[in-house]
Each structure stands twice: as structure tokens, then as C-alpha cells.
């Protein structure tokens, strides 16, 4: 808390400008009206205030908006956003994607902070669902964003938003998350032809059931081993040797290198040795 002192003669700020960087904390407190700060918020980010000075400005804004900042202020916070606590952000109502982008830009290159997580949560809750534009924005800033959501939260993603998802966005997703995303992806890409469909659906196959894998095996898709290893074990086990051979195509030889790892290990143990021998890979059931 800055001590209350009268503003020295001639130092009363009439504009938010560069001259304020030379003000001591107590002078900023005494000489910059909160009302002035509120009207000229867009200038704050263009001025290289110290963290201590930003503390004073934040204190003034907090006092001005006890129920939370309005979006007209939030969109101009810039580096002042880094001073906000999750508790501050929970009071906000952010509806504009441009505001969200502006604040994510401030945090760019850093891990997702509790402040950013709270901001995104407020934004998505305000919108009611993770629409395509929002998902595009969030995954651009945080490729792992989608996989940070719970299955319950992912259920609010409309199928149309799946078009915004890139393979790398799903790298850290676990099977429970893919279980939610796969049916949405299947719905989103249902009108694509075979090869194009497989390219799009491939990243989501960790949530695919057995019958869908069987169907894919009839389409000469040549699934790579990395994708196969991410499939649900319970979905792979019922597949026959012939179906796995068709599913993998020329990549079937890779099974030998993965024979000790799930789901390959468990699948091998379920097959008749005679069938495995037809692959000519020396797999032992």
C-alpha cells in the first residue's frame, strides 16, 4: 500500500504519458487520477513502467472497479495483465476473442500460468462452448491446450471445432480424452473420401472402437506403427491377424520391434500361433 501524500505542485498528471515513468510510487499514487487512468488505458502498455509502478496503477484500477474490470479496460491491460491474480480474473467477463488474443500475446512463450488458465476458463464459460475460432486461437498459443481439458470439458467442443485441431495438439491427450474427441472427429470428417478421411482422423484414433478399426482395415490405409501403438488395447485385441495386416499394410513389419509393448504384446497373446506365423515376423504368442 502506497502512503497517501499530497501531489507536489505542478506534477498533477493531465495525460498518461512517458513523463510518468520518472514519478516515484507515491507520486503516481498522488498525482494520477484513477479517472484519468480509466480513460487512457491504451497508453499504459506503450510506456515502460517498472513493476513497482504497475502495482500502483493496478491498485487504482482495483479501486475503480471493485466488481471486476470492464472489457474496455481488460483489452488494454497489456503487461499489467501479468500483475493480475486468478482471483482478479474470476471477476471479469471477457467476451471478445480480440481481448483474449491481446492478453495471451502478453504471456506468449511462457508456460500456461494460473492467470491464463483462469482467463481461458472465464472466456470459454462465457461463450458456452469451445467454438472453432476460440480453439484455433488457444491451440496456436498453447498446442497442448486441448489435452489440458477434462473429458467433461471436452464434451462441450462442437464437432465443427475439430477442424481447427492439428495432430500436435493431441500429443499429450490420454485415452479418456480421445474417447470424447474421436466421435466428434468422426462426425466432423464423415463426408470426406477414404484417404483424406484417414489423414484427418488418424490423430484421433486413440479413441476408436474395434468396429471402426475393422472398417479402416478394409480401406488400404497403411497405418503407421506410432498410430497403432496409441490405439486402445481393448479395441485392438479383437482384431484378427488378417485385419491387422491390412490395417498396417507395409508397416506390419514394425510389429516385431514392438512385440514387448502394449497393445502389440497383449494382441499377440490373443492370436493363434499359426495365424501369427503367416506374417513371417517370428512373433511368438
Amino acid at each position: 500500500e502506497v502512503e497517501k501524500t499530497a501531489c507536489p505542485s505542478g506534477k498533477k498528471a493531465r495525460e498518461i504519458d512517458e513523463s510518468l515513468i520518472f514519478y516515484k510510487k507515491w507520486e503516481l499514487e498522488a498525482c494520477v487520477d484513477a479517472a484519468l487512468l480509466a480513460t487512457q488505458m491504451d497508453r499504459v502498455n506503450a510506456i515502460p513502467f517498472t513493476y513497482e509502478q504497475l502495482d500502483v496503477l493496478k491498485h487504482k484500477l482495483d479501486e475503480l472497479y471493485p466488481q471486476g474490470y470492464p472489457e474496455s479496460v481488460i483489452q488494454h491491460l497489456g503487461y499489467l495483465f501479468l500483475k493480475m491474480s486468478p482471483e482478479d480474473i474470476r471477476k471479469w467477463n471477457v467476451t471478445s476473442l480480440e481481448t483474449l488474443k491481446a492478453l495471451l500475446e502478453v504471456n506468449k512463450g511462457h508456460e500456461m500460468s494460473p492467470q491464463v488458465a483462469t482467463l481461458i476458463d472465464r472466456f470459454v464459460k462465457g461463450r458456452g462452448q469451445l467454438d472453432k475460432d476460440t480453439l484455433d486461437t488457444l491451440t496456436a498459443f498453447y498446442p497442448g491446450y486441448l489435452c489440458s481439458l477434462s473429458p467433461e470439458e471436452l464434451s462441450s467442443v462442437p464437432p465443427s471445432s475439430i477442424w481447427a485441431v492439428r495432430p500436435q495438439d493431441l500429443d499429450t491427450c490420454d485415452p479418456r480424452q480421445l474417447d470424447v474427441l474421436y466421435p466428434k472427429a468422426r462426425l466432423a470428417f464423415q463426408n470426406m473420401n477414404g484417404s483424406e478421411y484417414f489423414v484427418k482422423i488418424q490423430s484421433f484414433l486413440g479413441g476408436a472402437p474395434t468396429e471402426d478399426l475393422k472398417a479402416l482395415s478394409q480401406q488400404n490405409v497403411s497405418m503407421d506403427l506410432a498410430t497403432f501403438m496409441k490405439l486402445r488395447t481393448d479395441a485392438v485385441l479383437p482384431l484378427t491377424v488378417a485385419e491387422v495386416q491390412k490395417l498396417l499394410g507395409p508397416h506390419v513389419e514394425g510389429l516385431k520391434a514392438e512385440e514387448r509393448h502394449r497393445p502389440v504384446r497383449d494382441w499377440i497373446l490373443r492370436q493363434r500361433q499359426d495365424d501369427l506365423d503367416t506374417l513371417g515376423l517370428g512373433l511368438q504368442g
Epitope: 495525460e15 479517472a35 480509466a38 480513460t39 482495483d62 471493485p66
Partner: antibody, heavy 119, light 114 residues
Framework: EVQLQQSGPELVKPGASMKISCKAS????????MNWVKQSHGKNLEWIGL????????SYNQKFKGKATLTVDKSSSTAYMELLSLTSEDSAVYYC????????????WGAGTTVTVSS | DIVMTQSPSSLAVSVGEKVIMSCKSS????????????LAWYQQKPGQSPKLLIY???TRESGVPDRFTGSGSGTDFTLTISSVKAEDLAVYYC??????????FGGGTKLEIK
Amino acid sequence: EVQLQQSGPELVKPGASMKISCKASGYSFTGYTMNWVKQSHGKNLEWIGLINPYNGGTSYNQKFKGKATLTVDKSSSTAYMELLSLTSEDSAVYYCARVGGSSWYFDVWGAGTTVTVSS
Amino acid sequence: DIVMTQSPSSLAVSVGEKVIMSCKSSQSLLYSSNQKNYLAWYQQKPGQSPKLLIYWASTRESGVPDRFTGSGSGTDFTLTISSVKAEDLAVYYCQQYYSYPTWTFGGGTKLEIK
């Protein structure tokens, strides 16, 4: 001395629109939001809306959305309020008021503009 | 919106008497982070515009005589005039500025001089 000088009284017909002005002097016009307040029957005060003279941003009381439009002319340090589709309910005294330095109280008021809507 | 209720709606007192008027809000105007109450008092003399008397519930605006005192916290506030003068004949309004930007005024207390 900080002053807000408002335009004179108006007699207007129902259905018409009109514009009230409020000229600010004695302070930095772009440093303080300008507010408008309605006083009906010489008693009730109602906040209509505010405008940020620096960037033209506005915020309205839900009740007055579509009834009042706030604008500013920075070059002349003047705020305006246009009242649309006037009815007898709009007969009142309208004040412009500058927001206080540290929060949203009103430290300087104009003298008021009396608007009478009558055929 | 926060509803502001003032009482009494009018009162008549003699010069030199003490006056207390009340203002109640439908929700608390106290912000715990700064321990300030977001309430202002205005005086409106006949034929004039309102004039700021008190802000932050108890801070006198410069130039306001010290016979005017604001007090209270949370939802209950009072304006006290310690010794009424004839020039204090006016309507007194309270205003909350806690809920940006939907600020609301009380219905006013009319002070008459006997």
C-alpha cells in the same frame, strides 16, 4: 475553475429528436469520463450513460439504450447527448456531470438543460 | 441493479438543530480489499444542480463545511448536519458507485426549515 456549460431549454414535439450540449472548461477534457443524468419531476435522479472523451467509448444504462446517444467533440471539449423519438416521459432536466478523480462519483455538474416534450 | 432507499422522504427542522438522514442499499457497498464504501452524498438546492458533499461514505469534498458528516458502512449510511443553517434547505441524495457502470441514486430527503 472547472465548469460544465450546458445548452439552453428546449421545447420539442413528440416523436422528434434533439441534441443537448455540454462544454467543458478548466480541466483536461480527455482525462475524465462525462456522464449524463436525468431528473424527472424535480426529484428522481437516474444515470443515463457515460462517454470516454479520449476514445469515444460509451456505456449506457439499459433503460436508456436506444433513447440516448452520447458523442463528444474533442476539439471543442464538448459532450453531446442526442435524445431520440421523444415522448412526454422524456420531459425532464438533463445534467452532464464529470466523474470524480478517484472513483465514479460526480464532482462537477452542469446547470442542467430543461427538455419539455409537448405538442 | 443496486436499489438505494432514503428516509425520511422529508423533514422540517429549526435552525441550529441536528439532522440525521438515512440511506440504505440493497447490497453491501463495502469493498473488502480497500475497506472503502462506494457511496456519495449530494445536496441540491432549489433551482440548482446537485453538488457533491461526501464521497467514500465519509470523505468531505473540499469546500464543504464540517457540519456535514457522512458515516456508515456496508448497507446502512447516514448524513448528519450537526447544526442546520437556513442555507442548508435542499434535497439530499445518496448515490452508490460500487457496481460499474450502473450507478443508482436514492429517492432523496427533502430538508425544510421551520
